[in-house]
């Protein structure tokens, strides 16, 4: 439907408040180093005129697009030029030119504090003092640090923060109360955040038929009594909203996923019998629980898909003529059958199917081609099979935090180039697959390892991209989205990497140590892994053992110590020379 | 040496047909897809059709129901039946191979030298 | 309905100089079906790139391809005499019956 005035039509679909807090998150992630106080005031300039327009739909400027009226209003904050350099370029800019500038700009990791979490007492005096800036500080915070959260998400994490303050600073015990809840959501705000961010990047990287084909996949196990029509609409209206999202129209993101939300809960007869508690819910929560609800059970009669798909004589013909649509019904027919398969897997098999009958279509016997087809699958779906066997081992036999150091010194010798912070944090979020996805039964496990895994090599991705350091990396993260896992894993040491020079300064560590969380120790050692890795590429799984041991026992026995920073500067000389000795460097 | 050779134009009243053969020599064209691409004159390429190895054809959009793309394999021939003729079908007429390992791609590594069609009253 | 569009549809160059043509596809192609080909006057069209960047075996590597999706481009970095001739991009879709080239771009000497 055409509107005379947008910005009206979505302030009244969205209401005042998920229209205040829509523009706050789409401000804040474009201009992510403004202050909080700015936003505030352009979002309730922007409010004052979206009701003027409200009120009056033909008045002046309310028929202006909607990136053209947040575009100027972001024109005008005044520090553009000196806070963001080459942005303020954009501005010069037309629309959508304007917009796609600003969208270029957004940085994946900004330069900006750590946010430190204030005594409890603190924040709720803060929350009860004024309960909405309050949360809109929170919006802030979170959308300026992950310019592609999923902004209707966004709204759902603020619904639960406030709950949690609104129960919890009444509390006897606020902290034992508050805290397991904050670190819940700052958990399942990382997640979120990676969730989605690979999603724009196979939107913006790959285009939209990715998207789809990820979108066919996914929703084909979670509904796989829904018919093929019903899963096409679906993936529709679904690419269409986060296309919108990633494209920095959180507006109307917004308002098509609440439509999205309803036409599911409307049909649920024709989707999924796992629907019906989500759809008793309110809108932010229902949208959520749609998003996270477990497949479906499998239709008990399903026929073999050979039948259609490889012996039928119209495979060729129905290929030819409409490939997006017969390739569609392959990979929805594929993976409605296989919710034991990861989503990028199945995206691999349809891709091989793809390959062969273009390969076998124009040859003089087409069927005899293609006729093995299937058989093509089988090392497909044993090497992911085989990779999350052995690493579910490993993990089972060395518990999380060793896990990861083995993944660490793994992909340090892989990558070497790639930045110290980004290996560590990397590393870690890989290792984590462990203890997400080792408890499951097998028929789980692929699913959740591989599809997981995606996600945190888009993270390896994106931040490598804004400062390049490996052509290995730029090929296994540019060549093929559903092969990013395949193409790292099947990396071996990098031979061409000139070691590190030493650095003592580097392995120099003070009292400070001792005061920091078990986490955030554990992140201080395994930068020292990474950095000796660079040091030592060559250096054994034993070698590097050692030397992390010893590490260890120094740290424990300094932070014991009467006098700490004596300890750590004495005890660190004798372990720097020792490690030195036992790596030969 | 591989060698397309079209051959059957010439001038033809509008309303018309013609059938234009494309002989190939230096291959087994059973084992090959046959495309047929047309220019007129002073202006850009247009894909008509291709035929399968197998057989199986495929039109462009416009070219459905007036033309037809047919196969010989013991004579190592293609032809275009081209039917109820008009002025702007006047054009050079191409065979051309489809690169080997692709069905549906526009990927034509071997090509006739054309024939000229004119259809003119 | 399928657009092709390449441009520019012509360019005046000289030896030596670096000519870039673009074509640029409604919908986009599927995959990376976009091949671009080279023909004189009088001559039948010549395979030079297939799937957007992949060169046809004996094309000189001064021809490169690049893109996807709905924009590509055909560079030839440094121009030799051989090279004056009209160019033409071709795009594979979702249907086979949608296999369309764009308008052509002729490269004359300036």
């Known amino acids: 439907d055409a509107h005379k005035s947008e910005v009206a039509h979505r302030f009244k679909d969205l209401g005042e408040e998920n229209f205040k807090a829509l523009v706050l998150i789409a401000f804040a992630q474009y201009l992510q180093q403004c202050p909080f106080e700015d936003h505030v005031k352009l979002v309730n300039e922007v409010t004052e005129f979206a009701k003027t327009c409200v009120a009056d739909e033909s008045a002046e400027n309310c028929d202006k697009s909607l990136h053209t009226l947040f575009g100027d209003k972001l024109c005008t904050v005044a520090t553009l030029r000196e806070t963001y350099g080459e942005m303020a370029d954009c501005c010069a800019k037309q629309e959508p030119e304007r917009n796609e500038c600003f969208l270029q700009h957004k940085d994946d990791n900004p330069n900006l504090p750590r946010l430190v979490r204030p005594e409890v007492d603190v924040m709720c005096t803060a929350f009860h003092d004024n309960e909405e800036t309050f949360l809109k500080k929170y919006l802030y915070e979170i959308a300026r640090r992950h310019p592609y959260f999923y902004a209707p998400e966004l709204l759902f994490f603020a619904k639960r923060y406030k709950a949690a303050f609104t129960e919890c600073c009444q509390a006897a015990d606020k902290a034992a109360c508050l805290l397991p809840k904050l670190d819940e959501l700052r958990d399942e705000g990382k997640a979120s955040s990676a969730k989605q961010r690979l999603k724009c990047a196979s939107l913006q990287k790959f285009g939209e038929r990715a998207f789809k084909a990820w979108a066919v996949a996914r929703l084909s196990q979670r509904f796989p009594k829904a018919e093929f029509a019903e899963v096409s609409k679906l993936v529709t209206d679904l690419t269409k909203v986060h296309t919108e999202c990633c494209h920095g129209d959180l507006l109307e993101c917004a308002d098509d996923r609440a439509d999205l939300a309803k036409y599911i809960c409307e049909n649920q007869d024709s989707i999924s019998s796992k629907l019906k508690e989500c759809c008793e819910k309110p809108l932010l929560e229902k949208s959520h629980c749609i998003a996270e609800v477990e497949n479906d059970e499998m239709p008990a009669d399903l026929p073999s898909l050979a039948a259609d798909f490889v012996e039928s004589k119209d495979v060729c013909k129905n290929y030819a003529e409409a490939k997006d649509v017969f390739l569609g019904m392959f990979l929805y027919e594929y993976a409605r059958r296989h919710p034991d398969y990861s989503v990028v897997l199945l995206l691999r098999l349809a891709k091989t199917y793809e390959t062969t009958l273009e390969k076998c279509c124009a040859a003089a016997d087409p069927h005899e081609c293609y006729a093995k087809v299937f058989d093509e699958f089988k090392p497909l779906v044993e090497e992911p099979q085989n990779l999350i066997k052995q690493n579910c081992e490993l993990f089972e036999q060395l518990g999380e935090y060793k896990f990861q150091n083995a993944l660490l010194v793994r992909y340090t010798k892989k990558v070497p180039q790639v930045s110290t912070p980004t290996l560590v944090e990397v590393s870690r979020n890989l290792g984590k697959v462990g203890s997400k996805c080792c408890k499951h039964p097998e028929a789980k496990r692929m699913p959740c390892a591989e599809d997981y895994l995606s996600v945190v090599l888009n993270q390896l991705c994106v931040l490598h991209e804004k400062t390049p350091v490996s052509d290995r990396v730029t090929k296994c993260c540019t060549e093929s989205l559903v092969n990013r896992r395949p193409c790292f894993s099947a990396l071996e040491v990098d031979e061409t990497y000139v070691p590190k020079e030493f650095n003592a300064e580097t392995f120099t560590f003070h009292a400070d140590i001792c005061t920091l969380s078990e986490k955030e120790r554990q992140i201080k050692k395994q930068t020292a892994l990474v950095e000796l890795v660079k040091h030592k590429p060559k250096a054994t799984k034993e070698q590097l053992k050692a030397v992390m041991d010893d590490f260890a026992a120094f740290v424990e026995k300094c932070c014991k110590a009467d006098d700490k920073e004596t300890c750590f500067a004495e005890e660190g000389k004798k372990l720097v020379a020792a490690s030195q000795a036992a790596l030969g460097l | 040496e591989v060698q397309l050779l079209e051959s059957g134009g010439g001038l033809v009243q509008p309303g018309g047909s013609l059938r234009l053969s494309c002989a190939v020599s230096?291959?087994?064209?059973?084992?090959?897809?046959i495309n047929w691409v047309r220019q007129a004159p002073g202006k850009g390429l247009e894909w008509i059709g291709i035929?399968?190895?197998?057989?199986?054809?495929f039109y462009a959009t416009w070219a459905k129901g007036r033309f037809t793309i047919s196969r010989d394999n013991s004579k190592n021939t293609v032809y275009l039946q081209m039917n109820s003729l008009r002025a702007e079908d006047t054009a050079v007429y191409y065979c051309?191979?489809?690169?080997?390992?692709?069905?549906?791609?526009?990927?034509?590594?071997?090509w006739g030298q054309g024939t000229l069609v004119t259809v003119s009253s | 309905d399928i657009q092709m569009t390449q441009s520019p549809s012509s360019v005046s160059a000289s030896v030596g100089d670096r000519v870039t043509i673009t074509c640029q596809s409604s919908?986009?192609?599927?995959?990376?079906?976009l091949s671009w080909y080279q023909q004189k006057p009088g001559k039948a069209p010549k395979l030079l790139i297939y799937?957007?960047?992949k060169l046809t075996s004996g094309v000189p590597s001064r021809f490169s391809g690049s893109g996807s999706g709905t924009d590509f481009t055909l560079t030839i970095s440094s121009l030799q005499p051989e090279d004056f001739a009209t160019y033409y991009c071709g795009g594979g879709y979702s249907s086979i019956s949608d296999t369309t080239f764009g308008g052509g771009t002729k490269v004359e000497i300036k």
């Open positions: 799937e957007a960047s």
């Open positions: 035929i399968w190895a197998s057989g199986t054809t």
């Open positions: 919908p986009s192609v599927w995959l990376n079906f």
């Open positions: 051309a191979r489809t690169v080997p390992g692709y069905s549906t791609a526009p990927y034509f590594d071997l």
């Open positions: 230096g291959i087994d064209l059973s084992n090959y897809a």
